[in-house]
Every structure is written in structure tokens, then in C-alpha cells.
């Protein structure tokens, strides 16, 4: 016998108080598969948390951070503090990259720097606390003999932190 | 280990004003995000206010905006909650609450410790 309740189309639920009719989820609640027996309670997006998408009843509520923090947990489940570019957050809050590293992102960590010559080119642009170093020709391109210089490669896109 | 303490509850009538402290022990206090929540006789709890590590960024449930100033000192591991304009329904249990990772404000779903609370009771 086919259960009554698996003809509810997602945004319904079941109701076991009106023999088993599907009845709309109530205000500020949602189903988002079919056959449901209740609605789930929306997500509310207070304090720290912005709305990115208002809930429907067929999908949650979505949130975001405020402007000086960033999402951190499945869904956005915490807002972590922003720190400005050139730094990282550790345990002791935000610090400047050490010599040699960067960070270009106001969340993350510091990079190294590229180094050039494990390419075989020369620093075109040294590196800060807040970009990558740009490498340019190699040396050999760059002699009196050579008779064209390539152009200096781009500079590399560093990746972005995972979140 | 952890310790949230709370205190400065009672009885005040409607209008009047309450400063509530939470003195925290056990963790590096400067570090974590803190919050204040509350519980009316009989209902759920509420998110009231979050404050960051630094105490610079600051966040207000609606209904006390304006009313009710969350603030910290990071000297004295203490949290406070100052509140004005008073209501018969702020009437409740109020609780401090500690952030589970550095520098991040979470869910209230996912404060890690407790204190036990203080009773405010707004009444003529």
C-alpha cells in the first residue's frame, strides 16, 4: 500500500491531524524534499550574520558575514575576523607576515614568495607583505649578446585559502 | 578550567536599568568572542548580544537595540551587559557564553561553555 504521505510535494508536509493531507509548511518553515511529515524551522540570519538568501518554502535560509569578518563551517556556520592584507590570523590574533611570505587576501595564511630562479628567471619586482615577488627573464636573456628580451611573465595567481 | 560566572541580576521596575557582569577564568579570554543570552519563564532561549575578541564589533538581537550595550575588559576577563529602558519583557534568565574557536563568532548552537545564569525580573 502506497503511503499517502509520499505524494507531498517539497514546501508541504503532511499532516497527521487532517487525515494525512499535504498542508503548505507554516511561516518561517520549509521542506525541501517531498513526503515530509514536518517543516523545517528557517535559519534566521541575526547579529554577525547577514542574509545572503531569504528562506523559501522549499529551501533555507542562507547567511553570510558582515563586512570585516568571512564564512568559516559548512554553511557558513561562523564568522571568523577579517585581518588586512600583508597579515595572518594565529592564536595571538592578527600578525604581519614574516620576510619572505605574503598574504594578498584579508583572510588565510602568508606565502612564500615565489622564487624565481627555480624557473631559471630573475625578480623582476621584489616581493611585500602583501604581494608576490615577479619574476621576470632569465639572466641569460638579459646578457649584452641577447638579441630580444621576452616579455616578463605574468605574475602568478596565488590561490585562494580553502573555506 | 572554564568558568563563566554571572552576576548584578535582581529586581527592577520598568524603565529602570541593570549592569550584569560575567567574570571568565580557565581560557585566554582576549582571544574568544563572548555572548549574552536569555531565557523568559517558560519560553526558549534568546540570543540577546555578541561582542568580538576585541570588543570593537559589536551585535544586537532587535528587540534590545538601542536599550542594551554589550561591552568587555580584556584586563579583567569580564563581560558586561549594561541595560537601559527596561521592560516587563526582558523579564528572564540571562547567561554568558563563550565562543568555541579564537577570533570567530559562531551560532549560539555552538557556544562551548555556560555560566549559570543571573535572574532579571522587570516588575512594579
Known amino acids: 500500500l502506497q503511503d499517502p504521505c509520499s505524494n507531498c510535494p517539497a514546501g508541504t508536509f503532511c499532516d497527521n491531524n487532517r487525515n494525512q493531507i499535504c498542508s503548505p509548511c507554516p511561516p518561517n518553515s520549509f521542506s525541501s524534499a517531498g513526503g515530509q511529515r514536518t517543516c523545517d524551522i528557517c535559519r534566521q540570519c541575526k547579529g554577525v550574520f547577514r542574509t545572503r538568501k531569504e528562506c523559501s518554502s522549499t529551501s533555507n535560509a542562507e547567511c553570510d558575514c558582515t563586512p570585516g569578518f568571512h564564512c568559516l563551517g559548512a554553511g557558513c556556520s561562523m564568522c571568523e575576523q577579517d585581518c588586512k592584507q600583508g597579515q595572518e590570523l594565529t592564536k595571538k590574533g592578527c600578525k604581519d607576515c614574516c620576510f619572505g611570505t605574503f598574504n594578498d587576501q584579508k583572510r588565510g595564511i602568508c606565502r612564500p614568495w615565489t622564487n624565481c630562479s627555480l624557473d631559471g628567471k630573475s625578480v623582476l619586482v621584489n616581493g611585500t607583505k602583501e604581494r608576490d615577488v615577479v619574476c621576470g627573464p632569465s639572466p641569460a636573456d638579459l646578457s649584452p649578446g641577447a638579441s630580444s628580451v621576452t616579455p616578463p611573465a605574468p605574475a602568478r595567481e596565488p590561490g585562494h585559502s580553502p573555506q | 578550567q572554564v568558568q563563566l560566572v554571572e552576576s548584578g541580576g535582581g529586581l527592577v521596575q520598568p524603565g529602570g536599568s541593570l549592569r550584569l557582569s560575567c567574570s571568565a577564568s580557565?581560557?585566554?579570554?582576549?582571544?574568544?568572542?563572548m555572548s549574552w543570552v536569555r531565557q523568559a519563564p517558560g519560553k526558549g532561549l534568546e540570543w540577546v548580544s555578541d561582542?568580538?575578541?576585541?570588543?570593537?564589533?559589536?551585535f544586537y538581537e532587535d528587540s534590545v537595540k538601542g536599550r542594551f550595550t554589550i561591552s568587555r575588559d580584556n584586563a579583567k576577563n569580564t563581560l558586561y551587559l549594561q541595560m537601559n529602558s527596561l521592560r516587563a519583557e526582558d523579564t528572564a534568565v540571562y547567561y554568558c557564553?563563550?565562543?568555541?574557536?579564537?577570533?570567530?563568532?559562531?551560532?549560539?548552537?555552538?557556544?562551548?561553555?555556560w555560566g549559570q545564569g543571573t535572574l532579571v525580573t522587570v516588575s512594579s
Open positions: 557564553a563563550k565562543h568555541p574557536l579564537t577570533y570567530t563568532i559562531a551560532t549560539m548552537n555552538d557556544y562551548d561553555y
Open positions: 580557565g581560557f585566554t579570554f582576549s582571544s574568544y568572542a
Open positions: 561582542i568580538n575578541s576585541g570588543g570593537e564589533s559589536t
